[in-house]
């Protein structure tokens, strides 16, 4: 089923209203602030939780050197228009008319610019580096034990298939998850990495999607792996088109 | 409310062994660092001893090799074993509880304390 | 081993801001972490004010906070009451070990 029969709630996205009103009875959950249907037994698509929280009421070295094209999500939260599909629509506009490009997870990939802008096509993040650092610990982590959870929770609790994780790499405190798939590797199904990573983002910070689980208890043989600082960094398909103003 | 209830003070004999045991309450115990902080009289505050919620453990220099801590999560307790008595653990025990999991950062995550069991040892 | 720094004592009227500050904490990856915890009378059961930098716990008044600036933390006591008068430890994280500073008496004028 979509939803969970008993009560009737989504164990996938807390951010809906769900009713016994689908075909034969069954439990329907709609997102909040779109009203579009959503499907419980997998993660719901970050246009659409963007939308239902801004309806909500108001409360040598291992690491990665991310890209110059790498994008990092500066412009915070918005109200995003979703597609049919509930993905990000190329382009977004605010209330004062003014537009700008996103990629598919939202986060902007061209200067902002008025109605006449033109975003062709929806421009695939293929590449999400999330960059994290960890409060102390009597010792570091044993680094194949902290890929192995890693790996583990990405499979298990955001469902997202193990080849999408790329690698994990650790210099204590540092840890970087490098999640990688490209629109050909992706097939019908498939948890969307920016989905995953989303999901990942609001569980570090406590503020989890699902629907009342606890929250993320991340654990590496025993101890507790609590992150105290989380940046994320997207890579595109094709690199993203800023004025050279920005980048001085 | 969290509440930590501490037991096993009193007058203790040098040479002797000694076995607190604080008790937790009001909190999920399991997920929480736990730990030791004892007061001479007249002085400051010591750190003793720490216990991860994955059981990880930190000593102070002045019990290192002498003390033990240890946790059961079934009954929401932490212990602390300390032998080979000196009249310099002459003291107040302070049972104290992280608002985190780990155990290297303690002392400057520490939300809650017990009221404290006196320790004497002396002949 | 590491030494918290902190003064000895220092006063202020009922109504005044009061800064003690606490340094010489353990340095995690450029990081440092401090707790202030509050004693009234010596025996008696201390008092979390702070905890890991700037954290206050829920019971505690908002007139405390604490901030970082480089290896050194300041509690800042802002229209201080006759009843914040106590001692003040500062606590820090070193590698294994907690340590302590010598603790800061407050008396209010």
């Known amino acids: 089923h979509t939803a969970a029969q008993d009560n009737c709630t989504c164990p996938t996205n807390k951010m809906t209203v769900c009713s016994p009103d689908g075909p034969g009875g069954r439990c329907q959950c709609r997102a909040l602030g779109s009203g579009m249907a959503v499907d419980c037994s997998t993660l719901t698509s970050k246009c659409l939780l963007l939308k239902a929280r801004m309806s909500a009421p108001k409360n040598a070295r291992t690491l990665v050197r991310p890209s110059e094209h790498a994008l990092v999500d500066n412009d915070g939260l918005y109200d995003p228009d979703c597609d049919p599909e509930g993905r990000f629509k190329a382009r977004q506009c605010n209330q004062t008319s003014v537009c700008w490009c996103v990629n598919s997870v939202g986060v902007r990939r061209t200067d902002k610019g008025d109605l006449s802008l033109r975003c062709d096509e929806l421009v695939r993040t293929h590449h999400i580096l999330i960059d994290l650092r960890h409060r102390p610990t009597a010792g570091a982590f044993n680094h194949s034990d902290l890929d192995a959870e890693l790996r583990r929770l990405f499979r298990e609790r955001y469902r997202l298939h193990p080849k999408f994780v790329a690698a994990v790499h650790y210099e204590q405190p540092t840890i970087q998850i490098e999640l990688r798939q490209n629109t050909s590797q992706k097939a019908a199904g498939d948890v969307d990495i920016g989905d995953a990573a989303y999901y990942f983002e609001r569980d570090i910070k406590g503020e989890s999607l699902f629907q009342g689980r606890g929250g993320l208890d991340l654990r590496v043989r025993g101890e507790p792996l609590q992150v105290e600082r989380t940046l994320i960094y997207y890579l595109d398909e094709i690199p993203p088109k800023f004025s050279m103003k920005r980048l001085t | 409310a969290v509440t930590l209830d501490e037991s096993g003070g009193g007058l203790q004999t040098p040479g002797g062994a000694l076995s607190l045991v604080c008790k937790g309450s009001g909190f999920t115990f399991s997920s929480y660092a736990m730990g030791w902080v004892r007061q001479a009289p007249g002085k400051g505050l010591e750190y003793v001893a720490a216990i991860s919620s994955g059981s990880s453990t930190g000593y102070g220099a002045a019990v290192k090799g002498r003390a033990t801590i240890s946790r059961d999560t079934g009954q929401s307790t932490v212990r602390l074993q300390l032998n080979n008595l000196r009249a310099e653990d002459t003291a107040t025990y302070y049972c104290?509880?992280?608002?985190?999991?780990?155990?290297?950062?303690?002392?400057?995550?520490?939300?809650?304390w017990g009221h404290g069991t006196e320790v004497i040892v002396s002949s | 081993a590491l030494a918290l720094t902190q003064p000895s004592s220092v006063s202020a009227n009922p109504g005044e801001t009061v800064e003690i500050t606490c340094s010489g904490g353990?340095?995690?990856?450029?990081?440092?972490?401090y707790g202030w915890y509050q004693q009234k009378a010596p025996g008696s059961a201390p008092v979390t004010v702070i905890?890991?930098?700037?954290k206050r716990p829920s019971n505690i008044p908002s007139r405390f906070s604490g901030s970082t600036s480089g290896s050194t933390n300041t509690l800042t006591i802002t229209g201080v009451q006759a009843d914040d008068e106590a001692v003040y430890y500062c606590?820090?994280?070193?590698?294994?070990?907690?340590?302590f500073g010598a603790g800061t008496t407050l008396t209010v004028l």
């Open positions: 353990g340095d995690y990856y450029g990081t440092y972490y």
């Open positions: 606590g820090s994280y070193d590698s294994s070990a907690g340590i």
């Open positions: 905890y890991d930098n700037t």
């Open positions: 104290a509880k992280s608002g985190y999991g780990g155990s290297a950062s303690y002392v400057s995550d520490i939300d809650a």
